[in-house]
């Protein structure tokens, strides 16, 4: 609450997050134009990469593009994308939502589409839908450990969300426990009124914000955390805006001397931790 | 403007960007002691990062040192390191610019000059200037979409500088266009009255200040983004305090059984996006 | 100090790191059985990550768990893991601790021991202590440079830490060369008041706070930074809640064509730069 | 059904050489260990060397140096070079592989045996 009479300070923050869970994924893998069943575990190596303090990635869901290499190939037929003949490829063109620079050239794509040949990472990804449901729609009981460490230098005080008196296996709950800083994702989600199985297909950014209203003086002292959630990126987001929340990252390697990649689109939650609030003193 | 009645609060922000465009590259390769012309085509897995939100980095140049092994080499002969005798090499010594251990012996580098030998990532990475013009230079049209959520905790207040009215194919303009959201790298630096073209040789840094004045009252309700640009690094810094932006990173790999590296230094435009502002109530 | 007349204004920042230096890192290697004395040569490419301006991570300390592959295999014995039968291992179970799914099945992980069989990246990670001494002990030596913008925009005033009287090859010091911008990791950790090597081992977070009390009225103009340091993570954890800082991370490879990695524990410090302050104008 | 079919074995003389091979057959997921073993006349099975998906390996102490355990994951397939044979390597060799069927349902399979005779 405000008290006038006091010299307020914003906070200076710190944050270090851990992640821990393991996810099976089933999904069909397709090897020498065989398909077949592939099952594998993901843990925090293979979803999460190393990040800064206030932010934290988990994957929930990919496509792969395996096998690329730099040569021509026809661009993927989406809409507005297909040719009849060369006329409609313009030598050395970059379309924005293309992968590659066209060579002037239609050429055919499969037995009934042509499209424009390009110079590109070939065969070019294929523009399909995020798999349904998520491929580590488990990661919602995965766990995330918020650790918060803040300081308001005017008034030279630092403490943290952590006490010693915490116990180590406790679990968030806004009721019972709020003061606990081990997170399961699918409750960060509950708590923002959002589901974590459909947010998982398309990703999203998941806000925790972490406020501190601290009262510093001997006589009344108070400084703990309060923690709530919010959804930051806009579920409602027209198709051109990119919906969602995903990236693309790739796996370079050498076959037969020839440089070729994976290519993957990552698609996961961004957990942005927010950290605000002000320390007063008389 | 400033409304002295009004309880002002700092901004909350979140942003998400998205960089889309390819660039093609012609460069000299040289394999097997041939120089030929290598033509290659990069795409946002590429030349992008997968990093936070506030910064978002795009490569611009680079220089490559390919097949380097743990072993002993003659250090590179920039100023000042070039020897005659095993005397002017300490054994064990780590010169803080080069970029291995010496041994204590001086050893021919070439036909011409003698270094230190040191042990080291071998060869060692030639100190060459960044290639002019940039390899990239083609990045001055690729567009990035920067969506921002904001956050007033005091006030209840969320919006967001994407509204549902908007259409995904602007171009953001100061005049024409000022709401748009989408910003074409090489607009953002001549806003800034830097030369892209230049600055993506070296690198540097480059601010994106999203400036949110919001009047929450009813009766004279308004918030929505002012965008304005500003370049970040120092263009007439010392040379010893390392001008523009550059990193080295590197693609480890296996080849008859010896761990060897391919070590990049990119260069590159790092986009910092600042977000500040205040809202005012009653 | 507070002029009350002034009209404050926070610091909007922009921060910018390079680390130098190389480490001799000496350790055990295992090939093919055989045990031999390993001797490698780290620099900036190995030991650090292309991170954001406000953090930058020096690695200081690895454990590295090459080779895994997805099959099955026992899990680690650590405490409380341990099985006498197929009973005391349920199919499907994750448990947290633990990297991967169980099979329902208890199978000997050595002579003497026998775990329960899971589907995971094998050999499952040993849950081994960081070497002590830590690898890269000789980071203490490194050097890093911070180049700092900052900007009042209200006041429409931007200035940086790095002069152009400053000179590239000085080195902080609280007494004799407090402007300088060039720091000694182990310096940073010495003001701190904390021992580098101690917590080089476990990994830590150190706090380099930069704090602007700015002046800018022209009669008594005065803008300078003042650099601070502590640390941020907290020394006397309790082990549940992870001490020290580290993540996993992955390099992939196919060999036999079976998709392997080579996972690291990457202990280290990462280092958060804190600006703060107000600019004040009449 | 999941079959191992193994070959390769037969007599020879003291210091030569064999290559056994087993290959697994049929519908399945996924081979994990895969392993020799042998039963020589009035003695009980022993393991000679096994190998992981990811290739690694493990001995017997007695074929230490002298016999190699390989693997094709792309055949399923199991090798084991033995040179330097002695007589005391006389026994029927077995192959063995711990077979996903479907996802987390392993199975122990093994071959039928092959003979393998080193005269002196």
């Known amino acids: 609450s405000d008290k006038l009479y006091q010299r307020k300070e914003p906070v200076i923050s710190s944050v270090h997050t851990k992640v821990k869970g393991i996810a099976e994924v089933t999904e069909n893998v397709t090897e020498g134009g065989v398909t077949k069943l592939g099952h594998s575990i993901f843990d925090t190596a293979d979803y999460t990469f190393p990040l800064q303090g206030n932010s934290f990635f988990v994957m929930t869901n990919y496509v792969k593009s395996e096998g690329q290499v730099q040569t021509l190939c026809p661009e993927y037929p989406r809409r507005g994308a297909q040719c009849s003949s060369d006329r409609r490829c313009k030598k050395g063109w970059m379309d924005p939502q293309s992968k590659g620079i066209q060579t002037g050239r239609c050429v055919p794509y499969d037995k009934t589409r042509k499209t424009c040949e390009v110079s590109a990472w070939c065969p070019t990804e294929e523009e399909k839908e995020a798999p349904r449901p998520a491929l580590l729609r488990s990661a919602e009981n995965f766990t995330v450990l918020i650790k918060n460490n803040i300081h308001f230098p005017g008034h030279n005080y630092t403490t943290r969300n952590i006490l010693p008196t915490m116990n180590g296996s406790c679990t968030f709950h806004k009721t019972w426990d709020p003061q606990c800083s081990i997170f399961r994702l699918g409750d960060i989600f509950q708590e923002a009124g959002e589901n974590f199985t459909e947010v998982a297909v398309q990703g999203g950014i998941m806000g925790i914000e972490i406020y501190w209203d601290c009262n510093l003086d001997s006589w009344s002292h108070h400084c703990r955390p309060r923690y709530s959630f919010r959804r930051l990126d806009d579920k409602n987001m027209d198709e051109s805006f990119v919906p969602g929340y995903n990236f693309r990252y790739a796996k370079y390697y050498k076959e037969n001397n020839v440089e070729k990649r994976t290519l993957i689109k990552a698609f996961g939650i961004r957990f942005d931790i927010l950290v605000f609030g002000t320390g007063g003193k008389f | 403007s400033d409304k002295l009645y009004q309880r002002k609060e700092p901004v909350i922000s979140s942003v998400h960007t998205k960089v889309k465009g390819i660039a093609e590259v012609t460069e000299n390769v040289t394999e097997g002691g041939v120089t030929k012309l290598g033509h290659s085509i990069f795409d946002t897995a590429d030349y992008t990062f997968p990093l936070q939100g506030n910064s978002f980095f795009v490569m611009t140049n680079y220089v490559k040192s390919e097949g380097q092994v743990q072993t002993l080499c003659p250090e590179y002969p920039r100023r000042g390191a070039q020897c005659s005798s095993d005397r002017r090499c300490k054994k064990g010594w780590m010169d803080p610019q080069s970029k291995g251990i010496q041994t204590g012996r001086c050893v021919p580098y070439d036909k011409t000059r003698k270094t230190c030998e040191v042990s080291a990532w071998c060869p060692t990475e030639e100190e060459k200037e960044a290639p002019r013009p940039a390899l990239l230079r083609s990045a001055e049209n690729f567009t990035v979409l920067i969506k921002n959520n904001i956050h007033f905790p005091g006030h209840n207040y969320t919006t967001r500088n994407i509204l549902p009215t908007m259409n995904g194919s602007c171009t953001f303009h100061k005049t024409w266009d000022p709401q748009c959201s989408i910003f074409r790298l090489g607009d953002i630096f001549q806003e800034a009255g830097e030369n892209f073209t230049e600055v993506a040789v070296q690198g540097g840094i480059m601010g994106i200040e999203i400036y949110w004045d919001c009047n929450l009252d009813s009766w004279s309700h308004h918030c929505r983004p002012r965008y304005s640009f500003r370049r970040l690094d120092d263009k007439n810094m010392d040379e010893s305090f390392v001008p523009g932006y550059n990193f080295r990173y590197a693609k480890y790999y296996k080849e008859n059984n010896v761990e060897k590296r391919t070590l990049i230094k990119a260069f590159g435009i790092r986009f910092d996006i600042l977000v500040f502002g205040t809202g005012g109530k009653f | 100090s507070d002029k009350l007349y002034q009209r404050k204004e926070p610091v909007i920042s922009s921060v910018h790191t390079k680390v130098k230096g190389i480490a001799e890192v000496t350790e055990n290697v295992t090939e093919g059985g055989v045990t031999k004395l390993g001797h490698s040569i780290f620099d900036t490419a190995d030991y650090t990550f292309p991170l954001q301006g406000n953090s930058f991570f020096v690695m200081t300390n690895y454990v590295k768990s090459e080779g895994q592959v997805q099959t099955l295999c026992p899990e680690y014995p650590r405490r409380g893991a341990q099985c006498s039968s197929d009973r005391r291992c349920k199919k499907g179970w994750m448990d947290p601790q633990s990297k991967g799914i169980q099979t329902g099945r208890c199978v000997p992980y050595d002579k003497t021991r026998k775990t329960c069989e899971v589907s995971a990246w094998c050999p499952t990670e040993e849950e081994k202590e960081a070497p002590r001494p830590a690898l890269l002990r000789s980071a203490e030596n490194f050097t890093v440079l911070i180049k700092n913008n900052i900007h009042f925009p209200g006041h429409n005033y931007t200035t940086r830490n790095i002069l152009p009287t400053m000179n590239g090859s000085c080195t902080f010091h609280k007494t004799w060369d407090p402007q300088c911008s060039i720091f000694r990791l182990g310096d940073i950790f010495q003001e701190a008041g904390e021992n580098f090597t101690e917590v080089a081992v476990q990994g830590g977070i150190m706090g380099i706070e930069i704090y602007w009390d700015c002046n800018l009225d022209s009669w008594s103009h005065h803008c300078r930074p003042r650099y601070s340091f502590r640390r941020l993570d907290d020394k006397n954890m309790d082990e549940s809640f992870v001490p020290g800082y580290n993540f996993r991370y992955a390099k992939y490879y196919k060999e036999n064509n079976v998709e392997k990695r080579t996972l690291i524990k990457a202990f280290g410090i990462r280092f958060d730069i804190l600006v703060f302050g107000t600019g004040g104008k009449f | 059904e999941v079959q191992l079919v193994e070959s390769g074995g037969g007599l020879v003389q003291a210091g030569g050489s064999l290559r056994l091979s087993c290959a697994a057959s049929?519908?399945?997921?996924?081979?994990?260990?895969m392993a020799w073993y042998r039963q020589a006349p009035g003695k009980q099975r022993e393991l000679v060397a096994d190998?992981?998906?990811?290739?690694?390996?493990n001995y017997a102490d007695s074929v230490n140096g002298r016999f190699t355990i390989s693997r094709d994951n792309v055949r399923n397939t199991v090798y084991l070079q033995m040179d330097g044979l002695k007589p005391e390597d006389t026994a029927v060799y077995y192959c063995?592989?711990?077979?996903?069927?479907?996802?987390?349902?392993?199975?122990?399979?093994w071959g039928q045996g092959t003979q393998v005779t080193v005269s002196s």
């Open positions: 049929g519908s399945f997921f996924r081979v994990n260990n």
């Open positions: 063995y592989a711990r077979i996903e069927l479907g996802v987390l349902v392993p199975r122990d399979y």
């Open positions: 190998i992981t998906r990811g290739d690694r390996t």
